[in-house]
């Protein structure tokens, strides 16, 4: 009468799912910290660096009390997609100076991509509403000079580090509320 039915599909434990996402986020945080330090060693930053195309900060001490899982994951995914785009742009248009950050910058890009896939999977497993497909983002203009590329790298890695730092704290907090 055909093969016996397989074992019943166990629905994933949301805390375990979130745990593995936290681990990936922490790991990427450590990678970003290391790469930012490497960049500072090679090209010391003079003051603060900003890039208008980067996402604005989404979390702070005041926002933690009102955190909701769907909102956090949706926003985090959107911000990380933006950072992925900026890292790709940096590798393509950042100039020869930034080639000295390879292969680490490539590794960072691959791990960021992996975390994004993990977030997407987590959202579908938790049956959270899927965000609409991202509208095509306007292309990023190439840096005006070699120093412009280095300043952009400081801003991108600094912003990504801060975003991941808050993401770890927010995800840890949400885990306790599940």
């Amino acid at each position: 009468p055909g093969p016996p039915p397989g074992p019943p599909r166990v629905s994933p434990d949301p805390r375990a799912e979130l745990d593995s996402t936290v681990l990936l986020t922490r790991s990427l945080l450590a990678d970003t910290r290391q790469l930012a330090a490497q960049l500072r060693d090679k090209f010391p930053a003079d003051g603060d660096h900003n890039l208008d195309s980067l996402p604005t900060l989404a979390m702070s001490a005041g926002a933690l009390g009102a955190l909701q899982l769907p909102g956090v994951l949706t926003r985090l995914r959107a911000d990380l997609l933006s950072y992925l785009r900026h890292v790709q742009w940096l590798r393509r248009a950042g100039g020869s100076s930034l080639k000295t950050l390879e292969p680490e910058l490539g590794t960072l890009q691959a791990r960021l991509d992996r975390l994004l896939r993990r977030l997407q999977l987590l959202m579908s497993r938790l049956a959270l509403p899927q965000p609409p497909p991202d509208p095509p983002a306007p292309p990023l203009a190439p840096p005006s000079s070699a120093w412009g590329g280095i300043r952009a790298a400081h801003a991108i890695l600094g912003g990504l580090h801060l975003t991941l730092d808050w993401a770890v704290r927010g995800l840890l907090l949400l885990k306790t509320r599940l």
Partner: antibody, heavy 117, light 110 residues
Framework: EVQLLESGGGLVQPGGSLRLSCAAS????????MNWLRQAPGKGLEWVAV????????FYADFVKGRFTISRDNSKNTLYLQMNSLRAEDTAVYYC??????????WGQGTLVTVSS | QSVLTQPPSASGTPGQRVTISCSGS????????VNWYQQLPGTAPKLLIY???LLPSGVPDRFSGSKSGTSASLAISGLRSEDEADYYC???????????FGGGTKLTVL
């Protein structure tokens, strides 16, 4: 290089007031939550207050609620702590510190506040 | 009385491995990240470990952190004389809605 420089400490009488300042440089001040912490002579560390990066949210330790007010001016890259109704037990070195997530990654050198008659 | 509990003192000889413990409850260490700070004599505290076991830039990998349940620990291997300092553990506390510290551990290198 990230730098935090506190000022405004000194000797004040019990019941008096003092305003501490913390000048920040070397990073985008408006992106970071900022804190005040303190350390009484020969004692451990105590967290005092935190303010969100845009100044919209503030949290205080129970022992300073209603007496201390944390504020910031992002246009001046400066953090403040207004201390009223000071008590002898508020005597401490006061530190400002930056928070990127759950931790204090950079600290100032501290300013000493002495409350005594 | 500190919310987190640390031994007041610890000691070791150069080259040795020393561990400092920090115990709390589910509202702080159990549910939140643990951070460790080093305070050398006469100086401001410095971040040593964050998110339980991550090292900031510039901190040697002789330092390591771990966490299990409502307890955390800091390990220092290959002890050096310059490690003589006060060490503090810290975590956010959900019930107090603020950051809490341990009382600090004074490490002496014999």
């Amino acid at each position: 290089e990230v730098q935090l420089l506190e000022s405004g400490g000194g000797l004040v009488q019990p019941g008096g007031s003092l305003r501490l300042s913390c000048a920040a440089s070397g990073f985008t001040f408006s992106h970071y939550d900022m804190n005040w912490l303190r350390q009484a002579p020969g004692k451990g560390l105590e967290w005092v207050a935190v303010i969100s990066y845009d100044g919209s949210n503030k949290f205080y330790a129970d022992f300073v609620k209603g007496r201390f007010t944390i504020s910031r001016d992002n246009s001046k890259n400066t953090l403040y702590l207004q201390m009223n109704s000071l008590r002898a037990e508020d005597t401490a070195v006061y530190y400002c510190a930056r928070t990127p997530g759950s931790h204090f990654d950079y600290w100032g050198q501290g300013t000493l506040v002495t409350v005594s008659s | 009385q500190s919310v987190l509990t640390q031994p007041p003192s610890a000691s070791g000889t150069p080259g040795q491995r020393v561990t400092i413990s920090c115990s709390g409850s589910s509202s702080n260490i159990g549910n939140n990240a643990v951070n460790w700070y080093q305070q050398l004599p006469g100086t401001a505290p410095k971040l040593l470990i964050y998110y339980d076991d991550l090292l900031p830039s510039g901190v040697p990998d002789r330092f390591s952190g771990s966490k299990s349940g409502t307890s955390a620990s800091l390990a220092i291997s290959g002890l050096r004389s310059e490690d003589e300092a006060d060490y503090y553990c810290s975590a956010w506390d959900d019930s107090l809605n603020g950051v809490v510290f341990g009382g600090g551990t004074k490490l002496t290198v014999l």
